[in-house]
Interface confidence: low
């Protein structure tokens, strides 16, 4: 709204950089063949690139990534009782970001 | 724990708390009647609740919010030349979070 500019501070651009995000650990990352289990923890923190660049043709992208294996609990229900196993999920952390030109494919004429 | 799955460390739950997120300032927040302008900055940081709670019937929600007006530039194109105006956008920051029971409406029978 254009109205009162009284207490409004200048908006500061959210620069292109890594920020902490929440990653949901979906069950099919662990076992695609079986739905009869739970995963603990259900979500973890990851580092991801986000923010804006100076113009629309440029996007904030990861310039350096690192794969990080973490151990989760796979809680299977066997004969109505929980059975606990360990599983590894590989998370992707972004270590560095850059504003990268987005190449939009030209329409074929 | 550590050795059992090579270098995999135990996954740590992303707790329900405020984290910095990027909010895209869409043009219709400023002027729904006109599309012939740009906004600067195109995005800003906000504080938002995210993370997981202990079970599926509970969700991470904001328990305290604060509205924060910020001043943006509305760059109109008038006769092919940029004209700079100021506008206010009100952002919502989450100040505190809690794990809140999700009441799923019962199907009407």
């Amino acid at each position: 709204s254009l109205g009162s500019l009284a207490a409004a501070e200048p908006a500061v651009i959210a620069e292109c950089k890594t920020r902490t995000e929440v990653f949901q650990i979906s069950r099919n990352l662990i076992d695609r063949t079986n739905a009869n289990f739970l995963v603990w923890p259900p979500c973890v923190e990851v580092q991801r690139c986000s923010g804006c660049c100076n113009n629309r043709n440029v996007q904030c992208r990861a310039s350096q990534v690192q794969m990080r294996p973490v151990q989760v609990r796979k809680i299977e229900i066997v004969r109505k009782k929980p059975v606990f196993k360990k599983a590894t999920v590989t998370l992707e952390d972004h270590l560095a970001c850059k504003c990268e030109t987005v190449v939009t494919p030209r329409p074929v004429t | 724990s550590l050795g059992s799955l090579a270098a995999a460390e135990p996954a740590v739950i992303a707790e329900c708390k405020t984290r910095t997120e990027v909010f895209q300032i869409s043009r219709n927040l400023i002027d729904r009647t006109n599309a012939n302008f740009l906004v600067w900055p195109p995005c800003v940081e906000v504080q938002r609740c995210s993370g997981c709670c202990n079970n599926r019937n509970v969700q991470c929600r904001a328990s305290q919010v604060q509205m924060r007006p910020v001043q943006v530039r509305k760059i109109e194109i008038v006769r092919k030349k940029p004209v700079f105006k100021k506008a206010t956008v009100t952002l919502e920051d989450h100040l505190a979070c809690k794990c809140e029971t999700v009441v799923t409406p019962r199907p009407v029978t």
Epitope: K81, P82, K85 | S1, L2, G3
Partner: antibody, heavy 120, light 107 residues
Framework: EVQLVESGGGLVQPGGSLRLSCAAS????????MTWVRQAPGKGLEWVAS????????HYPDSVKDRFTVSRDNAKNSLYLQLNSLRAEDTAVYYC?????????????WGQGTLVTVSS | DIQMTQSPSSLSASVGDRVTITCRAS??????LNWYQQKPGKAPKLLIY???SLQSGVPSRFSGSGSGTDFTLTISSLQPEDFATYYC?????????FGGGTKVEIK
Amino acid sequence: EVQLVESGGGLVQPGGSLRLSCAASGFTFSSFWMTWVRQAPGKGLEWVASISAGGGITHYPDSVKDRFTVSRDNAKNSLYLQLNSLRAEDTAVYYCAESGGDIYSDFDYWGQGTLVTVSS
Amino acid sequence: DIQMTQSPSSLSASVGDRVTITCRASQSISNYLNWYQQKPGKAPKLLIYAASSLQSGVPSRFSGSGSGTDFTLTISSLQPEDFATYYCQQSYSTPLTFGGGTKVEIK
């Protein structure tokens, strides 16, 4: 390489106090629950205390509750056990161990132990 | 509290023998059961976690089985370096408890 090194053991009189330390290296200490386990001479293993990764949660068996306090300093990669009101039956080798992502895990890294002798 | 009872408390065996140690929990602990090996003057070493999962670096002659209240540690062919004391431990609930140990001696 993961290493846990205990220190601070020694001879102490009944009713006395002692502070044990465990220096950790080779892993992200702040991500792990840590545990103290003790072993009296010629006896089996006994769980003594556990502390969460951030240090906010602690667990003890009744045998040491209100006498022993586990703490940690993640900035120093160190685990501690404060032993108060010591009794002869507290004489044991005290081991620190890494407990994984929660208390309900296995202990797959152990220190070499430090001997506490309670005697007059 | 959950009591862990190991049997036998000691056994004598020869190199090449198949050795079985049992551990019984006073109530169901699902598969929250770990096995450790300890040699004199040394810290315990994790062999098996979650009842049947072999810890990395542990020889495949060691295996674990069981669920609920009854668990078994088996050494398929005893080697000279396996003479030690073995402990089971439940991590199902606090207080965390260990079995009394089984000493495996040379016959």
